[in-house]
Every structure is written in structure tokens, then in C-alpha cells.
Interface confidence: medium
């Protein structure tokens, strides 16, 4: 369909509430440092303009693309260069280069303080102005996560509002709110990481990589749907995510709603697990479909070998329509293996493709590819063994100890990476234990490897901004599906020149005593990374001793009448102690 005015079309499709929310998210993801009020002003102006276009699509500027309209709005901000530096240079470009330039300036690690929920203050804000409260939530999440999946953020904002509607009535607001907010926070962070990986796969590895990922995932989830159906959904889904990752949030949300409608209208041929999703309102419906439980496998699936090994026409099929044939293979293999991670399924498909590429050029292709399925076993065994070993380590050490083991492992592999990044990534890698090790055997592999893909993507995104390690660059850029095996295979870097010992790194203050437990852990883990950068060959025993002494030193000073005085006296002694242990 062609519309005279795209902005009018989107406003009518989405309705005023969602339109405003999405415009607010779009501006917040681009201008991450602007105060909320500034964004509200921009949103108000854009909304008023959209309404004039709805009334008369021929009105002045209504025929401009949304990129042009949004870009013009951003570039009209007087303090743009002052607050955002070279982002202002984008304004000298024409569309579509200007929009590309804005996208490149999104900051995955903005210097914005962590949100600390204060139940009393938040309830007061909520009761004073619900609309502003909803907007503020969108703003705070969007500016911290510039690639957050916008229509999904609208969903989380509704849940957030519901939590406050319930808890602000409660006698003990904090007891009601805090666990719910924490639970929601975990969901939101996971959603942010999932979307960041989707955007990275589209932007760094192309649309085909994203389609392959989606094909495998959807085939696992909807094994009763046939290949045609899955292919159609994959194509539509790729369009939706391409738009959101590209900052076209209005189009993305509109297309996502259309896709949810299509899936619900055709649920009989897609999955038996969608019934309750399809009875929900739009945002909940889309979220529910995305999180839908796996359908049961059809009972009458034929052995894969029939079509992909025993059939004498394999090479003809492969040569004449490579993508369709390999797509069919990935679909058939994935629907039969809900227990495999998506990355593993894609690795298997790659081996199958490489084998056919090789064998179909030979004299006797069927004899050459007859054993292709045997090649898959080592690919399956590698992550399974790795997960088994790491889960055993997690059971033995507990979450904090397991994180520390990973900090040691990864600091030795890539000591050039910044300390905050190593701490963040190793801590997140360590959470795989509590997330996945307690799961039933058949869920462990997909849980662990798919989660590790999210965390390693975070490392890749942060590292790309300031590249310091060739090893990290290699693992991040060579192959999306082999990132995890690539990082697992890294050995300690023997070429690394140890850092000088900087006493200030190990200077602590009284504030340590009042920090929440997780922040206390981060301080200790930061010291551990710095220690390893100074002494990369420190033994496990030495590190254990230092950490033990550190805990004792902190405990002692936090129990002393004058915390700060104790840290001032005991701190230097502790540093001497460390140097002695590591000498």
C-alpha cells in the first residue's frame, strides 16, 4: 500500500498512546543523555504534527519520510553539539546517510547511573501522574538500552504500571514492590540482550544469518508447522527486526502487530500452544507468541536420512536450489531437536553444507556424503561435555565462586580487555550456573549455549567500541555461530606483558561496608582482575589466599568503630601482604 503521508498512516495504525510511546523510545535511544522533559517536548511536537497530517495528508511536510522528520527534529536541538559532540556531524549528511550516522552513534554502554528503586518515592510519582510514570519508564530503559525491542518495551511498561497499581495500595509497599521489580528487571535485561544479539546478527552478519537463526528457533518451537509456514513467518520476522534495529520503530511495531494477527489467524497450521496468546490484547499477544511453549513433535516424522543422505538426488537438490534445500534441512533437523541450542543446529547445518559442497563435486557423491550424519556427533559432544564440567564446578563452588573461576579463566585468556568489561561479562557468564544447571538434562544444552551467546555478544559489542584484543575481534567477527566455541578454545595469553602494580587499585574506603552484596562482590572481583593483570601466572592457591585475606580485612574494618580510620591503617598493610603472597 502507498500512503501520501507515512506518519499519518502509522499514527492511524498504532493509535495515539502507542505512537507517543514509540516516538519517545526512538528519541531516548538516540539522545541518551537528554533529560526526560526535553524528550517529552519533542514527542509532543511530533504528535501534534502527526495529527495535522491525519487531518490533511497533503499538508506541508506530511509527505516526508519518518527518518527525515525525526532527523530534522534531532538536528534542530540547539545544544546538540555541546552535549553529543560529533553526533552533530550527522546533521550535515543527507538521508539515508544521516540516519545511518545516528545509528552508529548509539552508545551501548552509556554513562548513566544504575536505577535504584525507592518504593515510597515511586508510588508517589505513580499516584501523581500515571501517564508521566509510564513515559519515564520507557525513557529510562530506552536510553540505557538503545537497541531495546521497542514494541516489547511498551509491553514491559504496561506490566511495570500493573505492578505499581497493585503494590502502591499495599500496607508494606517495599515488600510488595521490590521482589516484583527485581523479577521484571531480570526479564527486561534478558530481553535487551536477546534483541542486541538479533541486531548484531543482522548488522554484522547480514539478514541471511538472522533468517537462519529464526528458522532454527521457530522450527524447534512450532514443529507441527510446515516449512512453507515457518518460512513465511521467518521472512516477516526478519523485516520486523530489521526495522527495529534500524530505528524504524513505528513501522516495526506496526508490522509486528500484523505478524501476530497472521499467526493467530493461522494458528491451526502453526501450533496448538497459541490459543491463549491469541485471546489477549495486542502487546500481550505478541509477547505471548514470542515466548510460546514448544509444541509437541508430530508422531509420524520420517528419518532425516531418507531425504538428506539416502536420496540419490541430494546433489541435484543442493545444486539447483541451495538455500531452499539447506533451509529444508535446517527446518527438519531443528524440529526433531528441541534439546539443541540454535547455535549448535546452525553449526550442524554448516557442516552439512560444507560436506555437500565438497562431495557434489566428486566422482561418487553418495559414497562421499553417506557418513555426513556421523560428523555431527563431535559438534554435539563438545558443548555437552563443557556444560557437564562447568555445572559440576558450579555445584562445587556456588554462584560467587563460579563467577570468580570464570573471572580468572577469562582474564587469563584476554587480559587486554578492560577490567569493568571483564567483571561484567564473567559475572554474567557465571549466572549460567543458576539459570541452566538445575534444568532437566534435555533442556541444559539449549539453555546454556543460547544464554552464553547473549553474554558473549555483550562482550563483542563492548569490545568493538574500543578494540584491544585481536583474539576477541577474531572470535567476534569470524562466525556468529562459532563465537562460543571460539572463546572456549582460547588459551591463556602468553604474549601479555603484565601491568605495573598500582597501589591505588587496592585502596578501599568505608563506603564498602554499606554497599549491597552484589556491589561488594563487584569491588572484590575488580580487585581480582587487577591482580591477575599484574600477576597473570598467579596460582589458584595464591589467589584463594589473597581473596580470603581481603574478605578478612573488609570484615575487620567494617566491624571497627571508625571504618575509614581502619581502612586507612589496614589498607597499606593489606597491599604489602598481597605483594608478599604474589612475590
Amino acid at each position: 500500500d502507498t500512503y501520501k503521508s507515512e506518519i499519518a498512516h502509522r499514527f492511524k495504525d498504532l493509535g495515539e498512546q502507542y505512537f507517543k510511546g514509540l516516538v519517545l523510545i526512538a528519541f531516548s535511544q538516540h539522545l541518551q543523555q537528554c533529560p526526560y522533559e526535553e524528550h517529552v517536548k519533542l514527542v509532543r511536537e511530533v504528535t501534534e504534527f502527526a495529527k495535522t497530517c491525519v487531518a490533511d495528508e497533503s499538508a506541508e511536510n506530511c509527505d516526508k519520510s519518518i527518518h527525515t522528520l525525526f532527523g530534522d527534529k534531532l538536528c534542530a536541538i540547539p545544544s546538540l553539539r555541546e552535549h553529543y559532540g560529533d553526533l552533530a556531524d550527522c546533521c550535515e549528511k543527507e538521508e539515508p546517510e544521516r540516519n545511518e550516522c545516528f545509528l552508529q552513534h548509539k552508545n551501548d554502554n552509556p554513562d548513566i547511573p544504575k536505577l535504584k528503586p525507592d518504593p515510597v518515592a515511586l508510588c508517589a510519582d505513580f499516584q501523581e501522574d500515571e501517564q508521566k510514570f509510564w513515559g519515564k519508564y520507557l525513557y529510562e530503559i530506552a536510553r540505557r538500552h538503545p537497541y531495546f525491542y521497542a514494541p516489547e518495551l511498551l509491553y514491559y511498561a504496561i506490566i511495570y504500571k500493573d505492578v505499581f497499581s497493585e503494590c502502591c495500595q499495599a500496607a508494606d509497599k517495599a515488600a510488595c514492590l521490590l521482589p516484583k521489580i527485581e523479577h521484571l528487571r531480570e526479564k527486561v535485561l534478558t530481553s535487551a540482550a536477546k534483541q542486541r544479539l538479533k541486531c548484531a546478527s543482522i548488522q554484522k552478519f547480514g539478514e541471511r544469518a538472522f533468517k537462519a537463526w529464526s528458522l532454527a528457533r521457530l522450527s524447534q518451537r512450532f514443529p507441527k508447522a510446515d516449512f512453507t509456514e515457518i518460512s513465511k513467518i521467518v521472512t516477516d520476522l526478519a523485516k520486523v527486526h530489521k526495522e527495529c534495529c534500524h530505528g524504524d520503530l513505528l513501522e516495526c511495531a506496526d508490522d509486528r502487530a500484523d505478524l501476530a494477527k497472521y499467526i493467530c489467524e493461522n494458528q491451526d497450521t502453526i501450533s496448538t500452544k497459541l490459543k491463549e496468546c491469541c485471546d489477549k490484547p495486542l502487546l500481550e499477544k505478541s509477547h505471548c507468541i514470542a515466548e510460546a511453549k514448544r509444541d509437541e513433535l508430530p508422531a509420524d516424522l520420517n528419518p532425516l536420512e531418507h531425504d538428506f543422505v539416502e536420496d540419490k538426488e541430494v546433489c541435484k537438490n543442493y545444486k539447483e536450489a541451495k538455500h531452499v534445500f539447506l533451509g529444508t534441512f535446517l527446518y527438519e533437523y531443528s524440529r526433531r531437536h528441541p534439546d539443541y541450542s540454535v547455535s549448535l543446529l546452525l553449526r550442524i547445518a554448516k557442516i552439512y553444507e560444507a560436506t555437500l559442497e565438497d562431495c557434489c563435486a566428486k566422482e561418487d557423491p553418495p559414497a562421499c556424503y553417506a557418513t555426513v550424519f556421523d560428523k555431527f556427533q563431535p559438534l554435539v559432544d563438545e558443548p555437552k561435555n563443557l556444560i557437564k564440567q562447568n555445572c559440576e564446578l558450579f555445584e562445587k563452588l556456588g554462584e560467587y565462586g563460579f563467577q570468580n573461576a570464570l573471572i580468572v579463566r577469562y582474564t587469563k585468556k584476554v587480559p587486554q580487555v578492560s577490567t569493568p568489561t571483564l567483571v561484567e561479562v564473567a559475572r554474567k557468564l557465571g549466572l549460567v550456573g543458576s539459570r541452566c544447571c538445575k534444568r532437566p538434562e534435555e533442556e541444559r544444552l539449549s539453555c546454556a549455549e543460547d544464554y552464553l551467546s547473549l553474554v558473549l555478544n555483550r562482550l563483542c559489542v563492548l569490545h568493538e567500541k574500543t578494540p584491544v584484543s585481536e583474539k576477541v575481534t577474531k572470535c567476534c567477527t569470524e562466525s556468529l555461530v562459532n563465537r562460543r566455541p571460539c572463546f572456549s578454545a582460547l588459551t591463556p595469553d602468553e604474549t601479555y606483558k603484565p601491568k605495573e602494580f598500582v597501589e591505588g587499585t587496592f585502596t578501599f574506603h568505608a563506603d564498602l561496608c554499606t554497599l549491597p552484596e552484589d556491589e561488594k562482590q563487584i569491588k572484590k572481583q575488580t580487585a581480582l582482575v587487577e591482580l591477575l593483570k599484574h600477576k597473570p601466572h598467579a596460582t589458584e592457591e595464591q589467589l584463594r589466599t589473597v581473596l580470603g585475606n581481603f574478605a578478612a580485612f573488609v570484615q575487620k574494618c567494617c566491624a571497627a568503630p571508625d571504618h575509614e580510620a581502619c581502612f586507612a591503617v589496614e589498607g597499606p598493610k593489606f597491599v604489602i601482604e598481597i605483594r608478599g603472597i604474589l612475590a
Epitope: D226, T228, N302, E313, N317, E320, A321
Partner: nanobody, 126 residues
């Protein structure tokens, strides 16, 4: 569900021609891998020709290569088998079979096709 209905069979002299049709309903024929099989009296079902779903890749049994042509008309949702230079050994009931979901693969294994027509008899005799 896919329903298939064959037509066009009959008696023909050796060296003659026939065109079989298979009308599909419940599914678009271009989304489906489809094939013709035949069954001579007292024998098992034998693959004759096939065409891939979504991609027009054709397949033929060695015994019919160069004589038979498989095709489809997506607008009519119909599959065809043009049979030329017919021989007495081509006498059989001809069945149309479908594998939905656009598996590009047209298998020669009858068991892999969930949907079948009721068949049309072709007799080649002088």
C-alpha cells in the same frame, strides 16, 4: 489437508500419448512437493516423476526419462503428466501424491508422501 483428484487415464495404443491431470484442493500446489507413482497389477508402487515445492526442479525414473514430462499450472492448482511414446509396460494405475510444506525434495519413496489421489488407470495395448 490436501485432496488430490486424478483424471485423463484410458486406453491408448503403443507409441501413443496421454496427458494425466491431478487437481489439488486444500493447499496451493506450488507449496508442495508432488509426484506421480504407478502400480502395475501384482507389483509395488513405483516412482515415475516428481517436482519440488516452491522450486521447479523435476525428477524422473530412468524408465520414463525423455518420454514423460511433469509440469504444474499454479493458477489452476493442477499437476500434469504428459506421456509420449507409450509402451505396454507403462500399463498401470497412476497416482498423484503430495508432500506439503514445500520440502523442495521430491522423494522416490512412496511412504514419505502423506497425501494420495484415488488413481487413474492407463492401459497401453494394441
Amino acid at each position: 489437508e490436501v485432496q488430490l483428484l486424478e483424471s485423463g487415464g484410458g486406453l491408448v495404443q503403443p507409441g501413443g500419448s496421454l496427458r494425466l491431470s491431478c487437481a489439488a484442493s486444500g493447499r496451493y500446489i506450488d507449496e508442495t512437493a508432488v509426484a506421480w507413482f504407478r502400480q502395475a497389477p501384482g507389483k509395488g508402487r513405483e516412482f515415475v516423476a516428481g517436482i519440488g515445492g516452491g522450486v521447479d526442479i523435476t525428477y524422473y525414473a530412468d524408465s520414463v526419462k525423455g518420454r514423460f514430462t511433469i509440469s504444474r499450472d499454479n493458477s489452476k492448482n493442477t499437476l500434469y503428466l504428459q506421456m509420449n511414446s507409450l509402451r505396454p509396460e507403462d500399463t498401470a494405475v497412476y497416482y498423484c501424491a503430495a508432500r506439503p510444506g514445500r520440502p523442495l525434495i521430491t522423494s522416490k519413496v512412496a511412504d514419505l508422501y502423506p497425501y494420495w489421489g484415488q488413481g487413474t488407470l492407463v492401459t497401453v495395448s494394441s
